[in-house]
């Protein structure tokens, strides 16, 4: 990569030196690499503490990964004239702990946003909607990647992390056009009830590597476009009839359920019956029981009703302390 203070089509990526003159529309910011031909700016692993102000107007793909941004304020990418071409923004691993309302305003073409691997102690409810109106202007976002954004325990706010993320996803119904949502590795214990209802265009939902114990209060009913549902590596014990019926009713879906601690007792009977006849579960013959101990490693598909018993509950008079 060559170093220069103004862009040149001869070098595919240009590392910029600081310049005394006012920034030109196509200048490359200090500590960044730019390619006008690829419409790409990379400011990667440079310990930046704020978003460069002098981003070139041609930027379509902006990588700001591996920095130390800490806070993303309102209008962090607002410029005059606006960055009208910016379509993909990657902020992963940049030590963000706060994303404020309107942080992504004035980016009319922003289709893909990746905030993964940032310990977000505070995510404003209006981070993606830009305003606190009950119905906001639709966000242009199509893909939102929020893997491993859970902060360490000592940095968590009093409110639930799940609730904070959910509020940002549903605010102003701004994300109705979202096709892809990744929420893997966030220690989610539950999925707030109303989130999926506000995301009717979802095609791909990744909730893998969380701590979801149950989907009883989650409705997938209106996700008629859903193609992939990733629930691997959670703490799911069983899927109940309501969930099974909803999943079966989705016309295009493929569900991934590997590595959950399935409890193979009498409550599992409906799920086993469903697994035997459904085509929606990928790799279903690799689902195995984790509990009770006598059933560990048994393949769910090979169980029958006689295998699935529950220990009788003793009446109180017969229970011992």
């Amino acid at each position: 990569t060559s170093s220069a203070s103004s862009s040149s089509s001869s070098a595919p990526f240009l590392a910029s030196a600081a310049s005394a003159q006012p920034p030109l529309p196509d200048q490359c910011p200090a500590l960044c690499e730019c390619s006008e031909a690829a419409r790409t700016v990379k400011c990667v692993n440079r310990n930046l503490t704020e978003v460069p102000t002098d981003l070139p107007l041609y930027v379509r793909n902006l990588f700001l990964t591996g920095n130390q941004l800490a806070v993303l304020p309102a209008g962090a990418f607002a410029r005059r004239p606006p960055l009208a071409e910016l379509a993909a923004l990657n902020l992963s691993g940049s030590r963000l702990d706060e994303v404020r309302g309107g942080a992504f305003e004035h980016l009319p073409s922003l289709r893909q946003l990746d905030l993964s691997h940032n310990p977000l102690a505070y995510l404003s409810p209006f981070a993606f909607s830009g305003s606190n109106a009950s119905i906001s202007a639709p966000s242009p976002l199509v893909e939102l990647i929020l893997n491993h954004i859970v902060p360490p325990d000592d940095k968590r706010q009093n409110r639930s992390f799940e609730g904070m993320v959910a509020a940002a996803l549903v605010a102003g119904r701004a994300l109705q056009g979202l096709h892809l949502l990744e929420l893997a590795s966030n220690h989610f214990l539950y999925l707030p009830r109303d989130v999926l209802a506000q995301l009717p265009s979802l095609r791909y939902l990744d909730l893998s590597n969380n701590s979801l114990v149950s989907l009883t209060y989650v409705s997938f009913r209106n996700l008629t476009h859903l193609e992939s549902l990733h629930l691997e590596d959670n703490a799911l014990k069983v899927l109940h009839n309501g969930t099974l019926a909803e999943l079966q009713g989705l016309p295009h879906v493929r569900v991934f359920l590997d590595n959950n601690p399935w409890v193979c007792d009498c409550h599992m009977a409906d799920m086993v019956t469903w697994l035997k006849q459904t085509g929606v579960v990928q790799g279903k013959d690799r689902l195995t029981c984790a509990f009770p101990e006598k059933m560990r490693n048994r393949v769910l598909l090979e169980l029958n009703s006689a295998d699935l018993d529950c220990d009788p509950i003793l009446p109180p008079s017969l229970q011992t302390s």
Epitope: S185, D233, D285, A290, N297, R298, V299, L301, E302, L303
Partner: antibody, heavy 116, light 107 residues
Framework: QVQLRQSGAELMKPGASVKLSCKAT????????IEWVKQRPGHGLEWIGE????????NYNEKFKGKATLTADTSSNTVYMQLSSLTIEDSAIYYC?????????WGQGTTLTVSS | DIQMTQITSSLSASLGDRVTIGCSAS??????LNWYQQKPDGTVKLLVY???SLHSGVPSRFSGSGSGTDYSLTISNLEPEDIATYYC?????????FGGGTKLEIK
């Protein structure tokens, strides 16, 4: 109690094929995956692949595709592993194990020696 | 493939010692880790599954712990019959992979 009994030692020539067996007793044979693991002298353990006897479903380590073929006979509760086009590198102890999320019971191993 | 590394290939300890054997994964494996014991005669046994659950019949002096990429097996009070090679194994993703093994010997 759960037991996996493997066939006896084999001495084979390079280029030949061999079929090792693993007979399961003491549990519902069709309800668990059977795993195969290779151990060359002085080396660690290497997963070859697995088969679910009741369905014939199998998964292989990419490294052993074309080398190992797993089959099952539910009438005799036996799983077989055929190794083809043998070379010196195939000389090893081969273990079967009852699988799933862990390999909770293992066979005693079959020693395969490939020598001209 | 996920690489499993047991940095200590051999370990010498005295009877009664507390011994810890380490294992690290090339990426996070979310506690999807098992430990096996292979005796000098070739017999292999499961000791610990899912990081810390003791398999039935395994003495309580064995315990497992860890998270993310780093895991360990501890023998709290070494006995003569514990002389063996110990292997860790990840089961989060096919192909299942094992560590290179740690051979435990008596001083």
């Amino acid at each position: 109690q759960v037991q996996l009994r493997q066939s006896g030692a084999e001495l084979m020539k390079p280029g030949a094929s061999v079929k090792l067996s693993c007979k399961a007793t003491g549990y519902t044979f069709t309800g668990y995956w059977i795993e195969w693991v290779k151990q060359r002298p002085g080396h660690g353990l290497e997963w070859i692949g697995e088969i679910l006897p009741g369905r014939g479903s199998s998964n292989y380590n990419e490294k052993f595709k074309g080398k190992a073929t797993l089959t099952a006979d539910t009438s005799s509760n036996t799983v077989y592993m055929q190794l083809s086009s043998l070379t010196i590198e195939d000389s090893a102890i081969y273990y079967c194990a009852r699988g799933g999320r862990d390999f909770d019971y293992w066979g005693q191993g079959t020693t395969l020696t490939v020598s001209s | 493939d996920i690489q499993m590394t047991q940095i200590t290939s051999s370990l010498s300890a005295s009877l009664g010692d507390r011994v810890t054997i380490g294992c690290s994964a090339s990426q996070g494996i979310n506690n999807n880790l098992n430990w096996y014991q292979q005796k000098p005669d070739g017999t292999v046994k499961l000791l610990v599954y899912y990081t810390s659950s003791l398999h039935s019949g395994v003495p309580s002096r064995f315990s497992g712990s860890g998270s993310g990429t780093d895991y360990s097996l501890t023998i709290s009070n070494l006995e003569p019959e514990d002389i063996a090679t110990y292997y860790c194994q990840q089961f989060i993703k096919l192909p299942y992979t094992f560590g290179g093994g740690t051979k435990l010997e008596i001083k």
